[in-house]
């Protein structure tokens, strides 16, 4: 008779592959199998009990032969029902069945807790066929058991669309307590009560808990897991852990630090990212948060001019992204800037103050009181104005830009003149007679060209007209002035 032995790395319903060095004996007795793998497991449970067939696992296939011979009932032999062992030990267990060859096509598989075992499990199936019966022993071994190996294992054989199921083999892995919930680090308010939780499981049960604060036990008597420790309040940082004890020994949880919330440290490294005439973009590095998240920050801005009244502008912003654009500042001005941030406990001190300056900008207003009149004798237009207020020049005046537009009979022509900063009058040549001249003036700094004044119009008559009068910037709300001479 043939003896087949095989090992499978992955247990499939069909028995994959031969076990290295197939057994060459004609027929090895069913219950005295050699360990084909060559290693002696820590625990070996063989189906040595003779095992009456038990009806729960018996399959009596419905199909009969062409001669109507019923197929005999099949059942797995009884084996050990419960295995208790320590974590990291090895275990080997098996199920066995003798299948008459007349069944001709069977598959076998291992299942754990209702799920087929298809992973990298170490299963060995050995076949011992003779003329009438094939003895099958399916062994399952775990070299170093873990808690996750706990459960109910069964063999299933599929034969003629029937399923035969072995008795379950319960594996119970015992070891040191295993934490399912450990205390967590916390940040707490000074002198305020808080809770810590610790939970551990066996087997074996029960599991008892001791609490430890700064290396000293808190409770004299152990508490059954799970345990909640109520701490009435702390005035300084402390480290807590818990010890879980069972019959196998003790396991210590991680130590967790309980911090006391405090006001934050002041921000550091306040720096200028960008300056314009009227805004400054700053950034800062937040200080230590005092074990409580930052809520918002305050930017304090003082004019650095010793002659200023020393008032402080305050701008509030969110704590993130450690960046703020300070607006509504004066051009060409110096400022001192500090930052302070707050958490639920309170405000930090102000950061070290830094100096920052705004740049020169274009004037924000146009020249005032623009007047225009015709000097007919010299065929010129005279323009006069007043410079914008110093505060609104936003820089050092470098001059003025004069726009004069000449319109006559549907033709329009714009000319631009530049005037030095000292003047407050200009003279432009008449470009076209019998035309309207529209004049606008803008102040200019290195920061740019400011807004143009409202237009002032003057009519330039044909040669020979005598009378003339000046035109000037209208009072607000009046229509554009046009003087006909």
């Amino acid at each position: 008779a043939i003896t087949e032995a095989r090992e499978e790395a992955k247990p499939y319903p069909l028995f994959p592959g031969p076990f290295p060095g197939s057994l060459q004996t004609d027929h090895t007795p069913l219950l005295s199998l050699p360990h084909a793998s060559g290693y002696q497991p820590a625990l070996m449970f063989s189906p040595t009990q003779p095992g009456r067939p038990h009806t729960g696992n018996v399959a009596i296939p419905q199909v009969t032969s062409v001669e109507s011979k019923p197929l005999p009932p099949l059942a797995f032999k009884h084996t050990v029902g419960h295995i208790i062992l320590s974590e990291h030990k090895g275990v080997k267990f098996n199920c066995s069945i003798s299948v008459p060859n007349i069944y001709q096509d069977t598959t076998i598989s291992w299942w754990k807790d209702g799920k087929e075992l298809l992973g990298a499990h170490h299963a060995i199936t050995q076949f011992y066929p003779d003329d009438e019966v094939t003895a099958i022993i399916a062994s399952f071994s775990i070299t170093s058991v873990q808690r996750s190996d706990n459960g109910s294992y069964i063999c299933k054989m599929k034969i003629n669309n029937e399923e035969i199921v072995s008795d379950p083999i319960y594996i119970e892995v015992q070891g040191l307590p295993h934490f399912t919930k450990q205390p967590e680090s916390m940040n707490v308010t000074r002198n305020t009560a808080f809770n810590l939780t610790c939970q551990a499981v066996g087997p074996p049960e029960p599991v008892n808990i001791f609490w430890v604060q700064n290396s000293s036990r808190v409770n004299e008597q152990p508490e059954k897991s799970p345990s909640v420790l109520t701490v009435p309040g702390l005035t300084e940082m402390a480290v807590f852990s818990c010890e879980a004890h069972n019959d196998k020994g003790l396991t210590v949880s991680k130590g967790v630090q309980i911090n006391i919330k405090a006001i934050p440290s002041p921000p550091t490294e306040v720096s200028i990212r960008n300056s314009t005439a009227h805004s400054i973009l700053i950034s800062w590095v937040p200080g230590f948060d005092g074990y409580s998240p930052f809520r918002n920050c305050s930017i304090q801005v003082k004019e650095a001019d010793p002659l200023s009244n020393g008032s402080v502008m305050i701008f509030n912003t969110s704590a993130l992204p450690h960046l703020y654009q300070i607006k509504q500042l004066q051009a060409l001005a110096n400022y001192s800037i500090g930052v302070s941030c707050m958490n639920e406990i309170g405000w930090s001190a102000v950061s070290p103050w830094i100096l920052a300056s705004t740049t020169e900008g274009a004037p924000s207003v146009a020249p005032l009181n623009v007047t225009v009149f015709l000097n007919e004798s010299s065929d010129n237009v005279d323009i006069r104005w007043m410079k914008p207020p110093t505060k609104q020049q936003d820089g050092e005046l470098v001059g003025y830009r004069i726009s004069h537009v000449w319109q006559s009979a549907g033709i329009s022509k714009e000319l631009l003149e530049e005037v030095g900063q000292n003047g407050s009058r200009a003279r432009i040549s008449v470009q076209v007679h019998n035309a309207t001249c529209t004049v606008r003036i803008a102040a200019v700094t290195r920061g740019g060209v400011g807004p143009f004044s409202d237009p002032v119009k003057i009519f330039i008559p044909a040669h020979g007209w005598v009378d003339y009068a000046p035109s000037s910037t209208p009072a607000p709300g009046n229509a554009d002035p046009v003087l006909i001479i």
């Epitope: 095989r6 069909l14 592959g17 032969s65």
Partner: antibody, heavy 120, light 107 residues
Framework: QVQLVQSGAEVKKPGASVKVSCKAS????????MNWVRQAPGQGLEWMGW????????TYADDFKGRVTMTLDTSTSTAYMELRSLRSDDMAVYYC?????????????WGQGTTVTVSS | DIQMTQSPSFLSASVGDRVTITCKAS??????VTWYQQKPGKAPKLLIY???TRHTGVPDRFSGSGSGTDFTLTISSLQPEDFATYYC?????????FGQGTKLEIK
């Protein structure tokens, strides 16, 4: 010794049927399933199905369902395979092959093959 | 259905050479793979089953390996009688399927 002896070559017309026999000897016929495998000229092997020689229950490959019938005569330890509605692409050598063991689906003993020619 | 893809389809080698034929399954078949040898005009002969167990009487120059989806048949030192066509077959599940064959020819 264990052997499978098949019937002789057949020449059939398209649309006809062919029945190939396979006589087993040297072992208990009803303990081993019988498979049928064919091989077209110059081609590979194609599994057609198998029959449980104890129960007489056949299992057919989808490509042959409705055209093939596998039967037994246990008194003479003979298995039969009948293929109907023959087409030119059924021209092949047909083998019977013994299923090795109750837990294995490979073939340890083969018949010598029966050549079936389909020609009008 | 599980497809079995053999490579190469043709292989030229000399007596004494070591040759390897591979077979790839379209899905995991464990080690439920067998190899056959077929000579012209003859029925196939079983060489290897369970991916690596030699059938009775098969010379030890034939060896098989692999599991899951990748399998190989190795002939360590070719003999004149080894020139033939070789087929793999999976028997993880029905329908049983074969590779398309590798024809081993004398160089």
């Amino acid at each position: 010794q264990v052997q499978l002896v098949q019937s002789g070559a057949e020449v059939k017309k398209p649309g006809a049927s062919v029945k190939v026999s396979c006589k087993a000897s040297g072992y208990t016929f009803t303990n081993y399933g019988m498979n049928w495998v064919r091989q077209a000229p110059g081609q590979g092997l194609e599994w057609m199905g198998w029959i449980n020689t104890y129960t007489g229950e056949p299992t057919y490959a989808d490509d042959f369902k409705g055209r093939v019938t596998m039967t037994l005569d246990t008194s003479t330890s003979t298995a039969y395979m009948e293929l109907r509605s023959l087409r030119s692409d059924d021209m092949a050598v047909y083998y019977c092959a013994r299923k090795s063991t109750v837990v294995s689906r490979y073939f340890d003993v083969w018949g010598q093959g029966t050549t079936v020619t389909v020609s009008s | 259905d599980i497809q079995m893809t053999q490579s190469p389809s043709f292989l030229s080698a000399s007596v004494g050479d070591r040759v390897t034929i591979t077979c790839k399954a379209s899905q995991d078949v464990g080690d439920a793979v067998t190899w056959y040898q077929q000579k012209p005009g003859k029925a196939p002969k079983l060489l290897i089953y369970w991916a690596s167990t030699r059938h009775t009487g098969v010379p030890d120059r034939f060896s098989g390996s692999g599991s899951g989806t990748d399998f190989t048949l190795t002939i360590s030192s070719l003999q004149p009688e080894d020139f033939a066509t070789y087929y793999c077959q999976q028997y993880r599940s029905y329908p049983l399927t074969f590779g398309q064959g590798t024809k081993l020819e004398i160089k």
